[in-house]
Interface confidence: low
């Protein structure tokens, strides 16, 4: 024999049983209809008929290509989403009776919205720009400008910026500076050797010239047998047109695109981004 709970011994319990109050709320997975609580249909099933005093809720499974993803009282199942190939869509995950189909974009395309209702082509990064982040099915390509020391000479949805070739590691010298769209052009070492040798030769010629001028000045002096008075240091006058006679601040020569460029003292010998481009 089933034992009644203590409160059911009280009159209140008896009165409730004799005059049941219509429920105003139902338990989880139930719904209120005609003043009574009926069971909801489980996911994957639709409602055929509500429960009565004597019968349970009647449910039927969803048909093929249909689904219901919650406990429900729907009389019709929802159609699975159609991944329309004409909109660039394909099935990422096939739907079941309890889940909808998930669409994504064809390779090379990405969704135009979070719901992925249609697709557009991935953007390509123009020359001078590289791919920072390759596009996915839901996000477009992210491009970035190639920084100094890097270049991209193609329009691509995949290529990153490539570093300039290092001529030094190949025992070559830079013949043409790189830009954000072009690689550096390397060439043989001969130019560098010439750059070192030519100033040395000029230096030697200059020294010889100095010696000749000095000898010439000394030779011009009258030969006096008298004892030499103490001589003041003699100032040497250089001809104005001699190389190196300019007494301006020292300068440094550098190569830019095969042309010697005068580098100001105190300015770093680095070619600016504008100059590179």
């Amino acid at each position: 024999m089933v034992r009644l709970p203590l409160q059911c011994v009280l009159w209140g319990c008896l009165l409730t049983a004799v005059h049941p109050e219509p429920p105003t709320a139902c338990r989880e997975k139930q719904y209120l209809i005609n003043s009574q609580c009926c069971s909801l249909c489980q996911p994957g099933q639709k409602l055929v008929s509500d429960c009565t005093e004597f019968t349970e809720t009647e449910c039927l499974p969803c048909g093929e290509s249909e689904f219901l993803d919650t406990w429900n009282r729907e009389t019709h199942c929802h159609q699975h989403k159609y991944c329309d190939p004409n909109l660039g869509l394909r099935v990422q995950q096939k739907g079941t009776s309890e889940t909808d189909t998930i669409c994504t974009c064809e390779e090379g395309w990405h969704c135009t919205s979070e719901a992925c209702e249609s697709c557009v082509l991935h953007r390509s990064c123009s020359p001078g720009f590289g791919v920072k982040q390759i596009a996915t099915g839901v996000s477009d390509t992210i491009c970035e400008p190639c920084p100094v020391g890097f270049f991209s000479n193609v329009s691509s949805a995949f290529e990153k910026c490539h570093p300039w070739t290092s001529c030094e590691t190949k025992d070559l010298v830079v013949q043409q500076a790189g830009t954000n769209k072009t690689d550096v052009v390397c060439g043989p070492q001969d130019r560098l050797r010439a750059l070192v040798v030519i100033p040395i030769i000029f230096g030697i010629l200059f020294a010889i010239l100095l010696v000749l001028v000095f000898i010439k000045k000394v030779a011009k002096k009258p030969t006096n047998k008298a004892p030499h008075p103490k001589q003041e240091p003699q100032e040497i006058n250089f001809p104005d047109d001699l190389p190196g006679s300019n007494t301006a601040a020292p300068v440094q020569e550098t190569l830019h695109g095969c042309q010697p460029v005068t580098q100001e003292d105190g300015k770093e010998s680095r070619i600016s981004v504008q100059e590179r481009q």
Epitope: P85, N86, L87, E106, E107, G108, L121, H122
Partner: antibody, heavy 122, light 108 residues
Framework: QLQLQESGPGLVRPSETLSLTCSVS??????????WGWIRQPPGKGLEWIGS???????YYNPSLKSRVTISVDTSKNQFSLKLNSVTAADTAVYYC??????????????WGQGTMVTVSS | DIQMTQSPSSLSASVGDRVTITCRAS??????LNWYQQKPGKAPKLLIY???SLQSGVPSRFSGSGSGTDFTLTISSLQPEDFATYYC??????????FGQGTRLEIK
């Protein structure tokens, strides 16, 4: 400059298979930007789209011809091909290959080959 | 399939005339409509795409308009080289892409 050139036999016997190839020059087919399609035109009549192929192997066909058509794309040779089975006299037409561009993925055929006449006759 | 109906099926006009060809879709195709010109023995050439956008290299006397189901191709001042057959084509609901039956434009 992109050019398309159809090639294949000009005469096919009824019930046999019509096979055509389209060679693409001036651009790589290994790109996600285009579909490569076949369109035909019976003598004195209008244009009928047969189907299209994508570089990754996806194909779309005209439902009216679907059971008889195969389109394949060979990016290594920069070619795509059409096979139409069980031909009849009604398949006699000029066959064009074309590059198709969005909108709507297989949208506008905007570059065409010059066409090749195929006659179905015994 | 979406049916495309062109009118008229043929028309005669003179050089300098303004000519209009219409195309009607059996259901709404938004603005996914293209127009082609075909000369005898040649492949069709795309003139207008997306209802009103002029294809690169096409003379500006050609223009397209319309959206939904009704579209028009207009040639503002007919030139001798414009005598040809014109086709409309929908790319909204595909496959298949479908063409109109064509409009033959002849010299009067």
């Amino acid at each position: 400059q992109l050019q398309l050139q159809e090639s294949g036999p000009g005469l096919v016997r009824p019930s046999e298979t019509l096979s055509l190839t389209c060679s693409v020059s001036g651009a790589s087919m290994n790109t996600n930007n285009y579909y490569w399609g076949w369109i035909r035109q019976p003598p004195g009549k209008g244009l009928e789209w047969i189907g299209s192929g994508y570089y990754n192997g996806n194909t779309y066909y005209n439902p009216s011809l679907k059971s008889r058509v195969t389109i394949s794309v060979d990016t290594s040779k920069n070619q795509f091909s059409l096979k139409l089975n069980s031909v009849t006299a009604a398949d006699t037409a000029v066959y064009y290959c074309a590059r198709q561009t969005p909108p709507r993925i297989i949208g506008s055929p905007n570059i065409w080959g010059q066409g090749t006449m195929v006659t179905v006759s015994s | 399939d979406i049916q495309m109906t062109q009118s008229p099926s043929s028309l005669s006009a003179s050089v300098g005339d303004r000519v209009t060809i219409t195309c009607r879709a059996s259901q709404s195709i938004s603005s996914y409509l293209n127009w082609y010109q075909q000369k005898p023995g040649k492949a069709p050439k795309l003139l207008i795409y997306a209802a009103s956008s002029l294809q690169s290299g096409v003379p500006s006397r050609f223009s397209g308009s319309g959206s939904g189901t009704d579209f028009t191709l207009t040639i503002s001042s007919l030139q001798p080289e414009d005598f040809a057959t014109y086709y409309c084509q929908q790319s909204y609901s595909t496959p298949p892409i479908t063409f109109g039956q064509g409009t033959r434009l002849e010299i009067k």
